[in-house]
């Protein structure tokens, strides 16, 4: 009778084991072991027992002890079970960003590992077990579906293998995959709201605001604002689930025409975009042209109003005839026209919006000098010793210099309060002089003596 010890062995892959083959007869003709494994016999006293060291055990094996005794030949098998942890435990790659509400399939692949009967694959979210299955097939594959929720954001998913050899007196061997960190997001189906001027004047600045509600996580949202090829640099303000991106946009003559304003919001692997057109226009203030800004009384003056070729002008509130960018009026300059304002108002329609510009010029009319009865009376009669203010106003542009003299030397104190004396009596020659010429007027002052009763 042949026996083997141990009859069952669990050993790590590549390990060694001592196997004792024994026989019940004292003088066996033959005693040995049959195995493909490298073996080394350890020398022992006696004929009915042999010890072999079996090395580099790579897979399960059943070495067989045999003996040949007088009463016949017999055999005994030992069962070598090799254990080893998997060489690869991996979660199939997934995009890190996943939209909330999507069904996410987690797939774990396990290569190697033995004994398979003791090998379990576990899918986890954090420490929470999602699925536990025995490892079947090569590679073993375990899948589970997760409905992505907002609170899964930042959660780590992993796959763990458990080789449980505790029933065999060994330990529980665990291998864990690299974690997959899930980033969940919500990007609403509504495009971002874009508020901007429909029209923008060359060499001015406008403000563009792009906003969107219902985002998660809002801090991860990227906002791209651009006008044509010009990338804008917005200041982004975040709310709980919203953002508002505000940018200043400057335009030059090169940008003139219709430009595309875009606001793109990128979150996770999705994006939402809003497009709007902005018309960049150039509209200089209209021109008011006077034949001469300063003319003499009686001169013919042409006032012209010229604006942008597509503008419509009014000159002093009167529309151009025909309707268009030019208007003019002719006038003979009178003193009343001095200081008169000529206002040219231009309206330009840009993409349906009306833009208004205005320019005003003043006409200076040179006239005079003038001395007339109304402003410089020719006769004054005042009681002696009374307080009087001689008044004589000369008119003209430029304002004339006025002097009133008696006998070419004695001045009349124009505009000053005086006590009337006999000396004041007489005829004065008032002379108003300016660059426009000179006029004279005689003014007589009569002094009434008091009557004594």
């Amino acid at each position: 009778q042949t026996s083997v010890s141990p009859s069952k062995v669990i050993l790590p892959r590549g390990g060694s084991v001592l196997v004792t083959c024994s026989t019940s007869c004292d003088q066996p003709k033959l005693l040995g072991i049959e195995t493909p494994l490298p073996k080394k016999e350890l020398l022992l006293p006696g004929n009915n027992r042999k010890v072999y060291e079996l090395s580099n055990v790579q897979e399960d094996s059943q070495p067989m002890c045999y003996s040949n005794c007088p009463d016949g030949q017999s055999t005994a098998k030992t069962f070598l079970t090799v254990y080893w942890t998997p060489e690869r435990v991996e979660l199939a790659p997934l995009p890190s960003w996943q939209p909330v509400g999507k069904n996410l399939t987690l797939r774990c692949q396990v290569e190697g590992g033995a004994p398979r009967a003791n090998l379990t694959v576990v899918l986890l979210r954090g420490e929470k077990e999602l699925k536990r299955e025995p490892a079947v097939g090569e590679p073993a594959e375990v899948t589970t579906t997760v409905l992505v929720r907002r609170d899964h954001h930042g959660a780590n998913f992993s796959c763990r293998t458990e080789l449980d050899l505790r029933p065999q007196g060994l330990e529980l061997f665990e291998n864990t995959s690299a974690p997959y960190q899930l980033q969940t997001f919500v990007l609403p189906a509504t495009p971002p709201q874009l508020v901007s001027p429909r029209v923008l004047e060359v060499d001015t600045q406008g403000t563009v605001v792009c906003s969107l509600d219902g985002l998660f996580p809002v801090s991860e949202a990227q906002v791209h604002l651009a006008l044509g090829d010009q990338r804008l640099n917005p200041t982004v303000t975040y709310g709980n689930d919203s953002f508002s991106a505000k940018a200043s946009v400057s335009v030059t003559a090169e940008d003139e025409g219709t430009q595309r304003l875009t606001c793109a919001v990128i979150l996770g692997n999705q994006s939402q975009e809003t497009l709007q057109t902005v018309t960049i226009y150039s509209f200089p203030a209209p021109n008011v042209i006077l034949t001469k800004p300063e003319v003499s009384e009686g001169t013919e003056v042409t006032v012209k109003c010229e604006a942008h070729p597509r503008a419509k002008v009014t000159l002093n509130g009167v529309p151009a005839q025909p309707l268009g960018p030019r208007a003019q009026l002719l006038l003979k300059a009178t003193p009343e026209d001095n200081g008169r304002s000529f206002s040219c108002s231009a309206t330009l329609e840009v993409a349906g919006q009306l833009i208004h510009k205005n320019q005003t010029r003043e006409l200076r009319v040179l006239y005079g000098p003038r001395l007339d009865e109304r402003d410089c009376p020719g006769n004054w009669t005042w009681p002696e010793n009374s307080q009087q203010t001689p008044m004589c106003q000369a008119w003209g542009n430029p304002l004339p210099e006025l002097k009133c003299l008696k006998d070419g030397t004695f001045p009349l104190p124009i505009g000053e309060s005086v006590t009337v004396t006999r000396d004041l009596e007489g005829t004065y020659l008032c002379r108003a002089r300016s660059t426009q010429g000179e006029v004279t007027r005689k003014v007589t002052v009569n002094v009434l003596s008091p009557r004594y009763e």
Epitope: G317, T347, A351, G352
Partner: antibody
Framework: QSVEESGGRLVTPGTPLTLTCTAS????????MSWVRQAPGKGLEWIGI?????STYYASWAKGRFTISKTSTTVDLKITSPTTEDTATYFC???????????????????WGPGTLVTVSA | GYDMTQTPASVEVAVGGTVTIKCQAS??????LAWFQHKPGQPPKRLIY???TLASGVSSRFKGSGSGTQFTLTISGVESADAATYYC????????????FGGGTEVVVK
């Protein structure tokens, strides 16, 4: 000075229809003209405008559904593919004025036609 | 765009009473605002232009005020003939996609 719409009638859905607005006493080359409609139980809706030079602008809901064009004395509104929702009274209005105090022009519907009724029904 | 928000949507007023209708523009339209009265089967009638100027032939019981973004139409000494729908209309822009009229206010005279 007056404007009058014509061309309103009963049409089947999808049959293009053109309405005409005839201006009298003023020149269309000096004015912008707008089309406005009122559907039963609804408010006034601006459809679009044509400028003195022939540029056109439309309300967002009207874009692609209507086309405005003009001749020297008339302004046309084409309903490209009418639906039952286009049943309404259609008005044309002169939409351009100037303010003598500022000298500026502005949009001002100062002259309206009596309207023309369009019924779209299968 | 220039959104025009009109309030209230409907108002009931007794003969001889006063009614106030407000119109708010989403952006400044200076004084380029008109008020219209619309009765069924008739074209709209312009009552006020340039925010406060009374159109010719319109009763002085109608008064417009405001500038920028806030405008008001006041009808005093209401008569039964004033029963109609009133609309504000901005005169600043006719851009593509523009809002020109307010939503309207129905005035019911008791």
């Amino acid at each position: 000075q007056s404007v009058e719409e014509s061309g309103g009638r009963l049409v089947t859905p999808g049959t293009p229809l053109t309405l005409t607005c005839t201006a009298s006493g003023f020149s269309l080359s000096n004015y912008y003209m707008s089309w406005v409609r009122q559907a039963p139980g609804k408010g006034l809706e601006w459809i679009g405008i044509i400028s003195d030079s022939g540029s056109t602008y439309y309300a967002s809901w009207a874009k692609g559904r209507f086309t405005i064009s003009k001749t020297s004395t008339t302004v046309d509104l084409k309903i490209t593919s009418p639906t039952t929702e286009d049943t309404a009274t259609y008005f044309c209005a002169r939409d351009w004025s100037y303010d003598s105090s500022s000298g500026y022009y502005y949009y001002d519907m100062d002259l309206w036609g009596p309207g023309t009724l369009v019924t779209v029904s299968a | 765009g220039y959104d025009m928000t009109q309030t209230p949507a409907s108002v009931e007023v007794a003969v001889g009473g006063t009614v106030t209708i407000k119109c708010q523009a989403s952006q400044s339209i200076n004084s380029w605002l008109a008020w219209f009265q619309h009765k069924p089967g008739q074209p709209p009638k312009r009552l006020i232009y340039k925010a406060s100027t009374l159109a010719s032939g319109v009763s002085s019981r109608f008064k417009g005020s405001g500038s920028g973004t806030q405008f008001t139409l006041t009808i005093s000494g209401v008569e039964s003939a004033d029963a109609a729908t009133y609309y504000c209309q901005q005169g600043y822009s006719r851009s593509d996609g523009e809002h020109v009229f307010g939503g309207g206010t129905e005035v019911v005279v008791k």
